[in-house]
């Protein structure tokens, strides 16, 4: 169906109808949830400053390393070992690095007097040879130091290696000196200058404030704002031994964390320093542990270019600056409050879950009969009935049946397939509670109603024999007042229904049936109640009264309006009403599904 839109459709508002349950238990649960949720929401709002707009830090870093080291080197000169003392200053042990890093040399290996010529490789598994066949002219092994000439030559004694064109003599494959040559670098200090900016908040600051004592040294508790760090202390903080790391080298992270509250009333913006070892200290020898690189010092001797190759081991310090700056922002506050409102619905979800669980068939049939302490929970069935309105899908097969000798109503939602409706078991449905408010509108009609036999004469004249005369009750009849159906064979089983399940008195003999269903006075009152100016000819009046009587019976016996729409009247009642308000000619159509 196409949606039609009018002006009145636009100016509408829908809201939910709610059920308020006056219950100490559920009231307590509701407030418990609300208090817990409200407390958490407020705690999170304040502790995480969720009312602030946060912005990441933008930073620049500058470092200065200070310290002097005395190095005792063991060198071989003319086959004699000698101990050489030398002093290393900042220019000797630091190297310019890109980005937020600085490097401090802690150990080294020197290969002096190298020049470009042919010479044998240093003996290794890959370079040792027994004949020229083990060497290949032009071969460049990634692990090699030169280009092979294809010759296998004597290196020393009976050791032969492949000859290469390279910087000779070839650098020896040897371990880094132990202890580290610049072990005293542990006492070097580094000054870190860090400028930060939060452009969105138009705020700039730095880690070195005016009036800082420049002779200080950082200490985690005693001097946490000092920007001068002793290298040994940094390693102690991470649980590493500087002397051990100094041998092979390593990578250390200096973390500067800025957590800035830029609100005027709680302003705070100072850095927190922490340290983290960044290289893998468990790496095995084959995967090159530590941190090292090679560099060369070039010079000329007798017009021949030579170099001193130095394999440098040391510690690279990476300065990692991160953090956020936050300032109060009404939009962030509103967004946060909005995102937390849904949590307050948890109480309703939980209570609804309890009501639904405790009112389930499982609880009713398996738990309540055996568990005495669970008995108070039966009240949830009442809450559930008030809260939920169950609607059965109005299929063409849906029918409701009410027997006068049964407390419940039967719902039949299946095709009869030739079986009498009387014999179909169906599903038991609780009878709705009687609502007496409608009856209270009929005091005039129910008091002093004239006896039915004395009906106006003109109606009597119309009663042609439309009803069957046979007094032989059908087999399915239990009250003795039912008559066979006039419907075709295929639809007949729908009317094969008695007012009783077991033999006994017919409901049509009750005084109330006469007063509620057959009283012309009452039925006319009801018709006029609906249409005050109703004026009909005799035949249509009879039809109106008959259908009103059907409706009265259905409402009386089934209570619920929904059930009454699908109610099947017993044969005895149907024929008693038809007898009272007959059709002038033709057959009665029988029950028709309203949908």
């Amino acid at each position: 169906m196409p949606a039609c839109c009018s002006c009145s459709d636009v100016f509408q508002y829908e809201t939910n109808k709610v059920t308020r349950i006056q219950s100490m238990n559920y009231g307590t649960i509701k407030w418990f949830f609300h208090v817990i949720i409200f407390s958490y929401v407020c705690f999170a709002l304040v502790s995480d400053k969720l009312y602030q707009r946060k912005e990441p830090v933008i930073s620049s870093v500058h470092t200065k390393v200070k310290g002097i080291a005395e190095v005792k080197e063991e060198i071989v000169e003319n086959g004699v070992k000698k101990l050489v003392h030398s002093v290393f200053d900042t220019a000797d042990y630091t190297f310019p690095l890109q980005g937020n890093s600085f490097f401090v040399m802690t150990n080294f290996l020197k290969t002096e007097g190298q020049e470009q010529r042919l010479c044998p490789e240093y003996p290794t598994r890959r370079t040792l040879c027994s004949s020229d066949r083990g060497c290949k002219k032009g071969w460049m092994d990634p692990q090699s130091k030169g280009i092979q000439t294809g010759r296998c030559v004597v290196y020393e004694g009976n050791q032969k290696t492949c000859e290469v064109s390279a910087w000779c003599p070839i650098e020896a494959v040897e371990e880094a000196p132990r202890p580290a040559l610049l072990n005293s670098a542990e006492n070097f200090t580094v000054l870190i200058k860090n400028n930060i900016d939060f452009p969105g908040h138009n705020y700039t600051t730095r880690n070195i404030l005016p009036g800082l004592n420049i002779t200080c040294t950082f200490h985690k508790t005693q001097n946490p704002q000092c920007p001068i760090f002793r290298l040994g202390d940094i390693f102690r903080e991470t649980g590493d031994n500087f002397s051990d790391v100094a041998i092979q080298g390593g990578i250390m992270g200096i973390e500067i964390y800025w957590d800035c509250n830029l609100d005027r009333w709680f302003h705070h913006c100072r850095p927190k320093y922490s340290f983290r070892r960044l290289d893998d200290k468990t790496t095995n020898v084959s995967l090159y542990p530590g941190y090292n690189f090679r560099y060369a010092k070039y010079y000329k001797e007798n017009n021949v270019e030579k170099r001193t190759l130095i394999k440098v081991f040391g510690i690279r310090f990476d300065i990692l600056v991160f953090g956020t700056g936050g300032k109060f922002d009404i939009i962030q506050l509103v967004v946060y409050i909005g995102s937390t409102l849904s949590y307050f619905g948890l109480a309703a979800v939980f209570i609804d879950f309890l009501i639904d669980t405790y009112s389930s068939n499982c609880c009713r049939s398996h738990i309540y009969p055996w568990c005495k302490c669970c008995q108070p929970c039966v009240v949830n069935e009442y809450y559930y009935r008030k809260k939920c309105e169950s609607i059965v899908e109005p299929k063409p097969t849906l029918k409701y049946v009410s027997f006068v000798d049964e407390s419940h109503i039967r719902m039949v939602n299946q095709q009869l397939l030739g079986r009498s409706l009387q014999d179909v078991k169906g599903q038991e449905v609780p009878r709705p509670a009687m609502d007496f408010t409608d009856l209270s509108r009929l005091p005039l009609a129910l008091h002093d109603t004239p006896p039915i036999p004395g009906q106006p004469e003109e109606i009597q004249l119309l009663r042609k024999e439309a009803t069957p005369r046979s007094r032989d009750s059908p087999v399915w009849c239990q009250c003795g007042s039912c008559l066979p159906s006039q419907l075709p064979e295929s639809h007949r089983c729908l009317e094969e229904l008695c007012c009783r399940k077991k033999p006994g008195a017919c409901i049509t003999t009750s005084e109330l049936f006469r007063k509620l269903v057959l009283s012309r006075h009452v039925l006319q009152f009801l018709l006029l109640y609906q249409e005050p100016l109703l004026a009909l000819d005799v035949d249509s009046t009879n039809s109106r009264l008959r259908h009103c009587a059907y409706r009265c019976y259905a409402t009386w016996r089934f209570g619920s309006q929904d059930m009454a729409d699908f109610a099947i009247l017993p044969s005895c009642c149907r024929w008693r009403i038809r007898k009272e308000f007959p059709k002038s000619e033709g057959q009665y159509s029988g029950f028709k599904s309203p949908y």
Epitope: R125, R126, C129, S130, G134, C135, K136, W139, P142, S286
Partner: nanobody, 129 residues
């Protein structure tokens, strides 16, 4: 580490055939270049045949065309099929392994005993009538 065990040695007549087998322990067998070497009494250890982890082979000059090396990575074995055996083939045959995890052994160096880190105990082959 890899442990190597040679088997299949014994006495054979000249012109006969013999199949040696080298069984290796270790899950990373497929990353090793495998070689066969032999040592006759009073002589230097001599290269016989080798096969790299990716399947390329090399043979000693004296055995080319007579010996065949192969490998079965599923069984961790390296068989050496020896045909047309001669009396000068009499020696103790050793199986050897070279780790290629960090870099393949170049083909021209498969014959170099220095490349091989792990060695078996050897199996004696005697070619005599």
């Amino acid at each position: 580490d890899v442990q190597l065990v040679e088997s299949g040695g014994g006495l054979v007549q000249p012109g006969g055939s013999l199949r040696l087998s080298c069984a290796a322990s270790g899950r990373t067998f497929r990353h090793y270049a495998m070689g066969w070497f032999r040592q006759a009494p009073g002589k230097e250890r001599e290269f016989v045949a080798a096969i790299s982890s990716y399947g390329s082979t090399d043979y000693g000059d004296s055995v080319k065309g007579r010996f065949t090396i192969s490998r079965d990575n599923s069984k961790n074995t390296v068989p050496l099929q020896m045909n047309s055996l001669r009396p000068e083939d009499t020696a103790v045959y050793y199986c050897a392994a070279a780790d290629e995890t960090l870099g393949a052994v170049p083909n021209f160096r498969l014959h170099e005993k220095y490349e091989y880190e792990y060695w078996g105990q050897g199996t004696l082959v005697t070619v005599s009538s």
